[in-house]
């Protein structure tokens, strides 16, 4: 959590970022939020970033105000309108590249004063991973699969019963580049497994930690997978 | 060659549901942001959604919110759109369209579009 | 929502002729301002991307103009092949808003 206030001349406001993370190809969020102002025409919300002449966004009198835009962020950016009124300068960016990862600024007006706050962005590529029975291999096998990663993660596979146990000489890990050259699918294989257990497979990246369990029992198979992103912090 | 096939309209009830699917071919599916885009009888051209390259991100018209759901299947390369509490005035004809690749919002191939009518 | 405006509703003109279609936007939209063409029967085909970027395919009859909230479409010389309807499209942000059409029809 990043809090910042203003600087000389008009009341200093508080203004509240969260450090985050986007998945390329997909819709990201960068949050900021601000003291109120009764009057939506006294707001103004600038968002920068830094190494980038033009702005990333600016709202004005009620309405986005484009002419400044930087090339790489057109069509991509929009606030949350409805609710600039009540303090939330959060920015919705369309279509993540990996190339909008960096530092920004949210930079508050109103008719009580001034403020701003950084924001870390990181961008990077996570999905859930699903564990199935691998039912063409010649042995009990597991496999995990998730289609969009990056950063390359690690892939590590653990089990209820063995807990604390080294997987990593029964399986088998493999990574193939996604059509846009940038994102990989993960592929990883677990051999041996018995019955009446729980395995995990964790795959973890420096943006995201993503775990897929199956429990596969003589009767029915279970599955459940979460995913948690890393190193949110609010400034 | 681009090419977006859309199918699934038919007549429905009000209230009732219907699927739309999209078969795309000629391009990788998996890198650009889908549309559905409707048209109804003698009328102009509505946005009605989209769908993120990794189908995690949506975003909807007021109009349809709560009520259509836009999807996609990449392994199969095919866009959805499932409508349901279908009423009167969602009566058109649905066009599946592809955004353009990183910015900008238009919409560069179009398909040739299904008609949904939605009548007692 | 940004309201996007179209005018005339139609265009009465002849093959030869130059036509001026015009699109107002309800709040500036920078350059953020994409054209189609629609014929009977058709889907809708992209002429013109952020006002005035010309697409690969579309004949160079086809220009656009404007920045901010008054745009325009020009057609120098009229083939009989563009009689039909235009639309403006707000290229803007997430909601993705067209202009109602104008009607290019022969005189």
């Known amino acids: 959590l990043i809090i910042g206030f203003g600087i000389s001349g008009r009341h200093s406001i508080t203004v509240t970022t969260v450090a985050s993370a986007g998945n390329i190809g997909e819709d990201g969020i960068l949050s900021c939020t601000f003291e109120p102002d009764i009057k939506l025409s006294d707001i103004v919300i600038q968002w920068l970033k830094e190494g980038v002449l033009g702005l990333v966004h600016e709202f004005k009198e009620g309405k986005d105000e484009l002419s400044e835009q930087d090339e790489m962020f057109r069509g991509r950016t929009a606030v949350f309108a409805d609710q600039v009124i009540v303090g939330n300068a959060s920015l919705r960016l369309k279509n993540v590249q990996l190339t909008d990862a960096g530092t920004y600024k949210c930079y508050i007006i109103t008719s009580k004063g001034k403020g701003n706050a950084n924001l870390e962005y990181k961008t990077g590529a996570f999905s859930m991973p699903e564990v199935n029975v691998d039912y063409n291999a010649s042995s009990e096998t597991l496999r995990c699969e998730a289609p969009r990663w990056f950063p390359q993660p690690t892939v590590v596979w653990a089990s209820q019963v063995d807990q604390g146990a080294n997987f990593s000489e029964v399986s088998n890990t493999s990574f193939e580049l996604n059509s846009e050259n940038v994102t990989m699918k993960v592929v990883s294989v677990l051999y041996n497994v018995t019955i009446n257990n729980t395995y995990s497979c964790m795959i973890e990246n420096d943006i995201a930690k993503a775990t897929g369990d199956i429990k596969v029992t003589e009767s029915e198979i279970k599955r459940r997978s979460h995913l948690q992103l890393l190193n949110s912090k609010a400034s | 060659e681009v090419q977006l096939v859309e199918s699934g309209g038919g007549l429905v009830q009000p209230g009732g549901s219907l699927r739309l699917s999209c078969a795309a071919s000629g391009f990788t599916f998996s890198n650009y942001y889908m549309s559905w885009v409707r048209q109804a009888p003698g009328k102009g051209l509505e946005w009605v959604a989209y769908v993120s390259s990794g189908g995690g991100s949506t975003y909807y018209s007021d109009s349809v919110k709560g009520r259509f759901t836009i999807s996609r299947d990449n392994a199969k390369n095919t866009l959805y759109l499932q409508m349901s509490s279908l009423r009167a005035e969602d009566t058109a004809v649905y066009y599946c369209?592809?955004?353009?690749?990183?910015?900008?919002?238009?919409?560069?191939?179009w398909g040739q579009g299904t008609t949904v009518t939605v009548s007692s | 929502e940004i309201v996007m405006t179209q005018s005339p509703a139609t265009l009465s003109l002849s093959p030869g002729e130059r036509a001026t279609l015009s699109c107002r936007a309800s709040?500036?939209?920078?350059?953020?301002l994409h054209w189609y063409q629609q014929k009977p029967g058709q889907s809708p085909r992209l002429l013109i991307k952020f006002a005035s970027q010309s697409i690969s395919g579309i004949p160079a009859r086809f220009s656009g103009s404007g920045s901010g909230t008054d745009f325009t479409l020009t057609i120098s010389s009229l083939e009989p092949e563009d009689f039909a309807v235009y639309y403006c499209q707000n290229g803007h942000s997430f909601s993705l808003t067209f202009g109602q059409g104008t009607k290019l029809e022969i005189k």
């Open positions: 369209t592809r955004e353009s690749y990183s910015q900008g919002n238009y919409f560069d191939y």
């Open positions: 709040q500036s939209i920078s350059d953020y």
